[in-house]
Amino acid sequence: QEEDLPRPSISAEPGTVIPLGSHVTFVCRGPVGVQTFRLERDSRSTYNDTEDVSQASPSESEARFRIDSVREGNAGLYRCIYYKPPKWSEQSDYLELLVKESSGGPDSPDTEPGSSAGPTQRPSDNSHNEHAPASQGLKAEHLY
């Protein structure tokens, strides 16, 4: 009998409000044994896959998706999904990335580091859970 796959989680480091030109890393988490993590942008039509999976805790694995220099076009909704043979998980909640104009001072308020909840996270539409194989679709250069 196939196991029920837990929903992945998504978070962003250092937060979800990022100054223009700064870096952000999306962190997707799922159970041990995930083969591929996918970061989806706005809808399933644009995504990035990675098989670079590592431990997050004794019961969790994670993958990281880094954007080195955030542009205005990177703002939007992101969510994670993973493939653990023989099937894909459902999607995580959406995480909204906000890009702000760089401000001079270091004291400008940012989202807390590692933020993954709050008003910028939206529930996902889990009504459709069939996904293209990891070898198809738009890759990192399209997402980032």
Epitope: V32, V34, T50, E51, V53, Q55, P58
Partner: antibody
Framework: EVQLVESGGGLVQPKGSLKLSCAAS????????MYWVRQAPGKGLEWVAR??????????YYADSVKDRFTISRDDSQSMLYLQMNNLKTEDTARYYC??????????WGQGTLVTVSA | DIQMTQSPASQSASLGESVTITCLAS??????LAWYQQKPGKSPQLLIY???SLADGVPSRFSGSGSGTKFSFKISSLQAEDFVSYYC?????????FGAGTKLELK
């Protein structure tokens, strides 16, 4: 079909240097973590080094026994993995395997290349 | 560093029998454990990952169990090609350590 082909092994004197290469094919190299593992003649397996993908900022990790002497690197455009080995010691004599990660585990192994450190 | 204590170092068995190998981790590793098979002169092959998951193409006579610090690997109905070496490995924390290995011998 996943293929990992190591090269660059050979006989080298103590304190010498050697650079191992691994040509990868049959999978999306740039989205995978890659590893080097070694096995001394008649002995068990020892993890040597790990390099993560660009999405994880090419982070590198090393076994204490090789830290500050070995450097793992990759060329995603050529699907190549490297291990630069400096200040070699007799105890570095081993077969060196190039390994592809999968689910965070060592899913695919090359055939290995033999490094012999001897005066 | 996490030490992996694998036992037995060697074991004799007959064709068709079942054998079990154990691996003890010096601290909890959840299910970040793999089992590999190595034939003489060949590269290791992943058999079990995430403690219990069978790798692609691996026969169902191989199985893994356990979590935390105690893990077992079982081969049921031994075939001639199974009399080789087996290693456990933890992938929970760097350095990624292996057990010392178990050599299966034909009785």
């Amino acid at each position: 079909e996943v293929q990992l082909v190591e090269s660059g092994g050979g006989l080298v004197q103590p304190k010498g240097s050697l650079k191992l290469s691994c040509a990868a094919s049959g999978f999306t190299f740039n989205t995978n973590a890659m590893y080097w593992v070694r096995q001394a003649p008649g002995k068990g397996l020892e993890w040597v080094a790990r390099i993560r993908s660009k999405s994880s900022n090419y982070a590198t990790y090393y076994a204490d026994s090789v830290k500050d002497r070995f450097t793992i690197s990759r060329d995603d455009s050529q699907s190549m993995l490297y291990l630069q080995m400096n200040n070699l010691k007799t105890e570095d004599t081993a077969r060196y395997y190039c390994v592809r990660g999968g689910s965070g585990f060592f899913a695919y192994w090359g055939q290995g290349t033999l490094v012999t450190v001897s005066a | 560093d996490i030490q992996m204590t694998q036992s037995p170092a060697s074991q004799s068995a007959s064709l068709g029998e079942s054998v079990t190998i154990t691996c003890l981790a010096s601290q909890t590793i959840g299910t970040w454990l793999a089992w590999y098979q190595q034939k003489p002169g060949k590269s290791p092959q992943l058999l079990i990952y995430a403690a219990t998951s069978l790798a692609d193409g691996v026969p169902s006579r191989f199985s893994g169990s356990g979590s935390g610090t105690k893990f077992s690997f079982k081969i049921s109905s031994l075939q001639a090609e199974d009399f080789v070496s087996y290693y456990c490995q933890q992938l929970y924390s760097t350095p990624l350590t292996f057990g010392a290995g178990t050599k299966l011998e034909l009785k």
